[in-house]
């Protein structure tokens, strides 16, 4: 009982060291504004959580859209 | 929130002009800056913007002498401009370029401007 | 290159009147355009983006229209207030541009 306390606890202290959980820690969304469609072509590059770099954050919005899918943005620049 | 240019000021032909750009209440990784001039008496003219992710882009009149970099621990972007002549005279301004990706993109937020004249 | 093209240069109505300034791209900007004031010795106030959406604060008597190629402002019961320079500026693209803004159009109050 008392090892598993100490294991418990630790995994506890581990989990709260690590930071935010979930999705936060993922990516952020990709801002997406439904009454006002279309992207424009300046490349500003995000990288994706799939791995991808999309060349601008609505790129990656509409392509959410269109593969119904939910990929984060995990870092601003190209992955 | 807000933008201001550094000071300005009296530059010879030739000189390097380099105005500083900083930024209050608003983090450099998640917006675009833009730098805008406007000679005495004439209309606005774009010089570059720097976006979210770093990349400058330039006019291209501006390409060959212009330099647009940004450190965003200190929240400033910086414009440095060669090989400046008597046409490079102008009020310069920083403003913050919101969503660059989107068709929404529009500079919301402007500094008051500063002066650069170049003479010998 | 995505050059921008304002009409007219100047333009003076009778206060309550309607001003109507006219902004032509070279190429397809879809709706990525930006309408500003200007007043002399003041940084240029952001009015409409989007080609048609109101920024903050700015009264509902200017109005955008446009897409594509054409777009228009619109400043109905004018006021000595709107006595200003007047400028377009696309946000579509930064590649290859001479200039993102319009030459400006100098709207005058009678």
């Known amino acids: 009982m008392k090892v598993t306390g100490i294991f418990l606890l630790s995994a506890l202290a581990l989990l709260s060291l690590s930071g935010n959980t979930g999705a936060d820690s993922l990516g952020r969304e990709a801002k997406c504004y439904n009454e006002l469609n279309g992207c424009t072509k300046i490349y500003d590059p995000v990288c994706g959580t799939d791995g991808n770099t999309y060349p601008n954050e609505c790129v990656l919005c509409f392509e959410n859209r269109k593969r119904q899918t939910s990929i984060l943005i995990q870092k601003s620049g190209p992955c | 929130q807000s933008v201001k240019e550094s000071e300005g000021g009296l530059f010879k032909p030739t000189d390097t002009l380099t105005l500083t750009c900083t930024v209050s209440g608003f983090s450099l990784s998640s917006y675009a800056i833009g730098w805008v001039r406007q000679a005495p008496g004439n209309g606005l003219e774009w010089i570059g913007t720097i976006v979210t992710s770093g990349i400058p882009y330039y006019a291209n009149w501006a390409k060959s002498r212009s330099t647009i970099t940004r450190n965003t621990n200190l929240n400033t972007v910086t414009l440095k401009m060669t090989s400046l002549t008597a046409a490079d005279t102008a009020t310069y301004f920083c403003a913050r370029n919101l969503d660059p990706a989107y068709s929404t993109t529009r500079l919301d937020l402007w500094g008051q401007g500063t002066l650069v004249t170049v003479s010998s | 290159a995505y050059d921008m093209t304002q009409t007219p240069a100047s333009v003076s109505e009778p206060v309550r009147g309607t001003v109507t300034i006219k902004c032509q791209a070279s190429?397809?900007?879809?709706?990525?355009l930006a309408w500003y004031q200007q007043k002399p010795g003041q940084p240029p106030k952001l009015l409409i983006y989007?080609?048609?959406y109101l920024a903050s604060g700015v009264p509902s008597r200017f109005s955008g229209s446009g897409s594509g190629t054409e777009f228009t402002l619109t400043i109905s019961d004018l006021e000595c207030a709107d006595a200003a320079t007047y400028y377009c500026?696309?946000?579509?693209?930064?590649?290859?541009?001479?200039?993102?803004f319009g030459g400006g159009t100098e709207g005058g109050v009678k």
């Open positions: 989007a080609a048609s």
């Open positions: 500026h696309q946000g579509y693209s930064a590649s290859n541009v001479d200039n993102t």
């Open positions: 190429q397809s900007i879809s709706t990525a």
